[in-house]
């Protein structure tokens, strides 16, 4: 099919982060075409010679795929026709981090957009009361983080207080020798207060809250990826 050199189609990507060992998504959308057979999707990675993935004429074309991505990539084939060129990346590796290009060719024209993909490890923290300790103590644990994060404690009652003197944080390397288990202990905890354990690296920020009263303990945690922008 003919491609007008004057018309470039809009391609949009979103910076994202991958959790190593898990599956990730590299997001990319484009102006859709009416015929699937007229759409070509190429994913490239800066510094890599072969393609990350190619989809053309309605199916994967992997003859030029780089070895480091073999068997680990897929597009959402049924969504290509509506303009979704996102790439699923299986078993994310630390070395998958970098700059990617989503390159689209349709009968309307061509377009491309870059995205920064960060890789690391991040997990939800869980905060518990440590009943084995001699004083009232909280224990914050998160199983997988990389790179090494910072851990900060905060409390609702003592807002702005610095808990670094009454807390102790340790990092234990996991069996795969990359990610680490984060354990932070907060001492001298008072009752009827809400404490927050905040774990953060350049990829993600996670918070574990615990509300301790005489009658009950309430927990809540959430995780937010950083620097994810269009």
């Amino acid at each position: 099919f003919g491609i007008s050199g004057r018309h470039s189609i809009t391609v949009t990507t979103v910076a994202s982060a991958g959790n190593i060992g898990e599956d990730g998504i590299l997001s990319c959308t484009f102006e859709p075409d009416i015929k699937l057979s007229d759409i070509v999707i190429q994913w490239l990675k800066e510094g890599v010679l072969g393609l990350v993935h190619e989809f053309k004429e309605g199916k994967d074309e992997l003859s030029e795929q780089d070895e480091m991505f073999r068997g680990r990539t897929a597009v959402f084939a049924d969504q290509v026709i509506v303009g979704n060129a996102s790439l699923r990346l299986k078993n994310v590796q630390l070395t998958d981090a970098g700059t990617y290009k989503c390159y689209i060719i349709t009968s309307k024209g061509k377009g491309n957009a870059n995205l920064e993909y960060k890789t690391g490890a991040f997990s939800m923290p869980e905060v518990n009361v440590d009943y084995n300790a001699s004083s009232e103590t909280l224990r914050c644990e998160a199983p997988r983080w990389f790179p090494q994060p910072t851990v900060v404690w905060a409390s609702q009652v003592d807002q702005g207080a610095n808990f670094s003197e009454v807390s102790n944080t340790s990092f234990e390397l996991n069996s795969e020798n990359v990610t680490m288990k984060v354990v932070s202990v907060l001492y001298n905890v008072t009752i009827n207060n809400t404490y927050s354990c905040m774990i953060e690296n350049d990829i993600a920020k996670a918070t574990g809250d615990i509300k301790v009263t005489e009658s009950e303990i309430k927990r809540r945690s959430h995780l937010q990826l950083l620097n994810s922008k269009a």
């Epitope: 050199g5 510094g47 890599v48 010679l49 780089d66």
Partner: antibody, heavy 117, light 105 residues
């Protein structure tokens, strides 16, 4: 400032070997794939070889396959081209160039290789 | 293997527009890059991805790519534009065009 500086060129007899170097500065060398491109006297540009940022992947032009080896030392920010079994037709200015997606965005000034008996 | 064909020479008067073509089978499906090379100097990228310009390259340089032909257009040609121009695509390696000598009359 991004810079590429080639060295190692010279006059060599047919059948002999030569190793070219390209010192890179001003960017994170290991993040970028690199190329060698040559230009015979009075002729056009001819791509020779490419190497991935990590050094694990390499491509060669048919004209040099089996004779030339591209490599890199990311700790030294240096690209190499080992040229064996040199022929008269390998006489050229050799440029190293940084790969940018499907093209090349930065070139060195070139080093001259003359294969002559 | 993939081949790119350029006219050996193009002549243009100062202030006029020069067009240098690059022919290749279904080249419109590929990303085309253009390099300028002055005598005794290394090539310089002037247009990438068919029509984008690197920083520092004048707006007078533009590109298009359709069907079987990509075109480098230099408007308001100056004496300093006299050089060899090469188109290039990637096809499991860098493929260069045969080169075009631009002469400013």
């Amino acid at each position: 400032e991004v810079q590429l500086v080639e060295s190692g060129g010279g006059v060599v007899q047919p059948g002999r070997s030569l190793r070219l170097s390209c010192a890179a500065s001003g960017f994170t060398f290991g993040d970028r794939a690199m190329n060698w491109v040559r230009q015979a006297p009075g002729k056009g540009l001819e791509w020779v070889s490419a190497i991935s940022g990590s050094g694990s992947g390499t491509y060669y032009a048919d004209s040099v396959k089996g004779r030339f080896t591209i490599s890199r030392d990311n700790s030294k920010n240096t690209l190499y081209l080992q040229m064996n079994s040199l022929r008269a037709e390998d006489t050229a200015v050799y440029y190293c160039a940084r790969k940018r997606w499907y093209g090349m965005d930065v070139w060195g000034q070139g080093t001259t290789v003359t294969v002559s008996s | 293997s993939y081949e790119l064909t350029q006219p050996p020479s193009v002549s243009v008067a100062p202030g006029k527009t020069a067009r240098i073509t690059c022919g290749g089978n279904n080249i419109g499906m590929k990303s085309v890059h253009w390099y300028q090379q002055k005598p005794g100097q290394a090539p310089v990228l002037v247009v990438y991805d068919d029509s984008d310009r690197p920083s520092g390259i004048p707006e007078r340089f533009s590109g298009s790519n359709s069907g079987n032909t990509a075109t480098l257009t230099i408007s308001r040609v100056e004496a300093g534009d006299e050089a060899d121009y090469y188109c290039q695509v990637w096809d499991r390696g860098m493929i260069f065009g045969t080169g075009t000598k631009l002469t400013v009359l």
